[in-house]
């Protein structure tokens, strides 16, 4: 029987700014039962607090709701793990809110065909910003990435759509049934999670471009 | 105890291509960006650029972009920083360096001198 | 790219004395998100840089006390109440509110 392993606060998420999670990863337990407690401090603070919030963000996770959650202000953090025999710190972790965003997917995605008598066909795309970001404060850039496939492919082609929400694809095989999916990040942030598939079936006369090529 | 431990000194070429390294330990690789910055002799200090390990998203410095190559190799927690076509202005100690969930940098790698010369 | 001016180039200080450090920035730090992303950095002789200060005037962890950082907008400083041997080196500030991150020129200082 020995004192708790050292724990490791490994990942902080926001949807959003206004709230956030830290999760930390348990040491070994010293084969005894082990309590854990995380504790932080705000930058120009020297007032230690206790970790408001240990359900919300499920085992070993610590949740900040609304009124503990201040973007301009640094946290600093650490998490004590306490068994019979003794305890171990965490390494201090700082955390910046606007450096761990993980926005919500973007929403309503709409797929067309668009074949414009005087040019080649194109897929059209567009989608809105996830409800939850607040892109008018300037405080988020979100960049957005397309994925595609026909049904029954097993490989996803990728683009890069930066900061547009629109999108046009050239090249696409005639009579396919295609999957189109965005996600979002802000700069800094993390990737969302893939919007729900929308499927879009590409007509038998659709001309297929020599080069394979999209235009934003 | 978090460890950057960078790869050992390299002589190259001009047009020549370098790749150096960044072993990290002592936490979770994939959770914090890793930055690449470079110190010229009796020089300041530039920055490179960033990537997130978790998913290889990058972001450059204009004056880099095109030249410089990062990437990670996530199974060894390893960060590469690749530079082509040397010229002996590129002659500087690099140095990685890993942030926390911030944009400012706590951990240095080492460094690792790169000479370029002919 | 945001330019970072320090002055001055070097520093020689008699230990026990304050030592003073400013940095000017070619545009404002203050970030879109209201923060100020300055920080100072040290680099002893032979030595990767550590870091002193981060955003603007918060002490790292196991900085001592005697090393504050103040400023706003474009002007910042870095004090040293009381010069100790262990302190020589090059000192760095660095701003990371815009991209390409940037550094400061660097200020030596040293021990008279």
């Known amino acids: 029987q020995l004192p708790p392993g050292k724990p490791e606060i490994f990942k902080c998420r926001s949807p959003n700014k206004e709230t956030f999670t830290c999760w930390w990863r348990p040491g070994t337990d010293g084969g005894l039962p082990t309590n854990y407690s995380l504790t932080y401090h705000r930058e120009g603070e020297t007032l230690m607090h206790e970790c408001p919030d240990y359900i919300t963000g499920g085992p070993n996770s610590c949740h900040f709701g609304k009124q503990y959650t201040s973007m301009w202000r640094t946290y600093v953090m650490m998490v004590n793990a306490t068994n019979q025999m003794g305890s171990s710190f965490s390494d201090e972790l700082y955390v910046d809110v606007t450096y761990i965003v993980q926005p919500d997917p973007p929403l309503e995605l709409t797929v067309e065909v668009k074949q414009p008598e005087d040019r080649k066909p194109y897929l059209w795309m567009k989608w809105s910003p996830p409800t939850l970001i607040d892109l008018k404060t300037g405080w988020f850039t979100l960049l957005y990435e397309i994925r595609l496939k026909p049904e029954k492919a097993a490989e996803w082609e990728t683009h890069f759509a930066g900061q547009q929400t629109e999108f046009k694809i050239l090249s696409l095989h005639p009579g396919q049934k295609y999957l189109v999916q965005v996600r979002c990040k802000p700069d800094h942030g993390y990737w969302s999670a893939w919007s729900p598939a929308t499927f879009i079936q590409i007509p038998s006369d659709f001309i297929m471009n020599d080069h394979h090529h999209h235009h934003h | 105890e978090v460890q950057l431990v960078q790869s050992g000194a390299e002589v190259k070429k001009p047009g020549s291509s370098v790749k150096v390294s960044c072993k990290a330990s002592?936490?979770?690789?994939?959770?914090?960006?890793i930055h690449w910055v470079r110190q010229a002799p009796g020089q300041g200090l530039e920055w490179i650029g960033e990537i997130d390990p978790s998913d290889s998203y990058t972001n450059y410095n204009q004056k880099f972009k095109g030249r410089a190559t990062l990437t990670v190799d996530r199974s060894s927690s390893t960060a590469y920083m690749e530079l082509s076509s040397l010229r002996s202005e590129d002659t500087a100690v690099y140095y990685c360096g890993r942030s926390f969930f911030t944009n400012w940098f706590a951990y240095w790698g080492q460094g690792t001198l790169v000479t370029v010369s002919s | 790219d945001v330019v970072m001016t320090q002055t001055p180039l070097s520093l020689s200080v008699t230990p026990g004395q304050p030592a003073s450090i400013s940095c000017r920035s070619s545009?404002?730090?203050?970030?879109?998100?209201?923060?100020?992303?300055l920080h100072w950095y040290l680099q002893k002789p032979g030595q990767s840089p550590q870091l002193l200060i981060y955003?603007?005037?918060n002490r790292f962890s196991g900085v001592p006390d005697r090393f504050s950082g103040s400023g706003s907008g474009t002007d910042f400083t870095l004090k040293i109440s009381r010069v100790e041997a262990e302190d020589v080196g090059v000192y760095f500030c660095s701003q990371s509110t815009h991209v390409p991150f940037t550094f400061g020129g660097g200020t030596k200082v040293e021990i008279k």
């Open positions: 002592g936490y979770t690789f994939t959770s914090y960006w």
């Open positions: 545009q404002s730090l203050v970030h879109s998100n209201g923060n100020t992303y």
């Open positions: 955003k603007v005037s």
